[in-house]
């Protein structure tokens, strides 16, 4: 079953996906698509990386993490109800049938009437200690740094535990890390 993530209309949605490159800069192609992962490739591709950089993107979809270190988590900006559905993160490991496939379910909720306080986060990369804010409503938050190696079963269990008490997208502070090589 898919791991569920939630966002409100007008916010940014965050769908986590990670792998560990075999060596620094030794990147693996990744595709993100709308719809469950098919046998090969991604259907309805919204973003794609190659061994060096992002080589295909669409306007509201971008990578907010350090993709060169294997953080290929997808940000969908300014979501609408139409963005609800299953998204596929496919890590295209060389070799026959070696790809890692992750199906993530995005649930978009109508915006709350009462605006929540804007959250913020610090960057530590090229913009040292950079503050990020959303112009309307809460910002997406993301923890950059080491991520625990946990399997999808653990994530699913954690999602079930959190679903009733916290937003499922709080899972962004954990992520499935695929080691390559």
């Amino acid at each position: 079953s898919e791991v569920e993530y939630r966002a409100e209309v007008g916010q940014n949605a965050y769908l986590p996906c990670f792998y560990t490159p075999a060596a620094p800069g030794n990147l693996v192609p990744v595709c993100w698509g709308k719809g469950a992962c098919p046998v090969f490739e991604c259907g309805n591709v919204v973003l794609r990386t190659d061994e060096r950089d992002v080589n295909y993107w669409t306007s509201r979809y971008w990578l907010n993490g350090d993709f060169r270190k294997g953080d290929v988590s997808l940000t969908i900006e300014n979501v609408t109800l139409a963005d609800s559905g299953i998204y596929c993160c496919r890590i295209q490991i060389p070799g026959i049938m070696n790809d890692e496939k992750f199906n993530l379910k995005l649930v978009i909720k109508p915006a709350k009437v009462t605006p929540a306080p804007t959250r913020q986060r610090d960057f530590t990369a090229a913009f040292p200690r950079m503050l990020t804010t959303r112009g309307h409503g809460p910002a997406e938050t993301q923890t950059l740094g080491s991520l625990p190696d946990i399997n999808l079963t653990q994530i699913s269990t954690l999602a079930n535990e959190l679903r009733d008490s916290r937003l499922a997208n709080d899972l962004r502070d954990s992520g499935a890390t695929i080691r390559i090589g």
Partner: nanobody, 121 residues
Framework: QVQLQESGGGLVQPGGSLRLSCAVS????????MGWFRQAPGKEREGVSC????????SYPDSVKGRFTISRDNAKNTVYLQMNSLKPEDTGVYYC??????????????YGKGTQVTVSS
């Protein structure tokens, strides 16, 4: 051909303000994350602001937070940097930049040629 053309730089006294503009051509701005970088003499280029494709998400380092504001007008293919309460350490060449499909922390695809900002009394 992608072109980013900065304007609005100049000499200003400490405490003063400037508004930089970046005219974008050759790409669809609302599909790009845009940023402003600066480079002082003898120093590395550093990011001073970043804005997402729709303008809904912005970022600033502590050194300019509360003083600089980035904005964009996709209909006019223009990105702006409003700089208030300028300090001598803000002096440098300011570059407009664009990146496809990812946030600006991890490098940019395109840079303009820059506009000089000098803060001095």
């Amino acid at each position: 051909q992608v072109q980013l053309q900065e304007s609005g730089g100049g000499l200003v006294q400490p405490g003063g303000s400037l508004r930089l503009s970046c005219a974008v051509s050759g790409l669809t701005p609302d599909a790009y994350v845009m940023g402003w970088f600066r480079q002082a003499p003898g120093k590395e280029r550093e990011g001073v602001s970043c804005i997402s494709p729709s303008g809904g998400t912005t970022s600033y380092p502590d050194s300019v937070k509360g003083r600089f504001t980035i904005s964009r007008d996709n209909a006019k293919n223009t990105v702006y940097l409003q700089m208030n309460s300028l300090k001598p350490e803000d002096t440098g060449v300011y570059y407009c930049a664009a990146v496809a499909g990812r946030w600006c922390d991890y490098g940019m695809n395109y840079y303009g040629k820059g506009t000089q900002v000098t803060v001095s009394s």
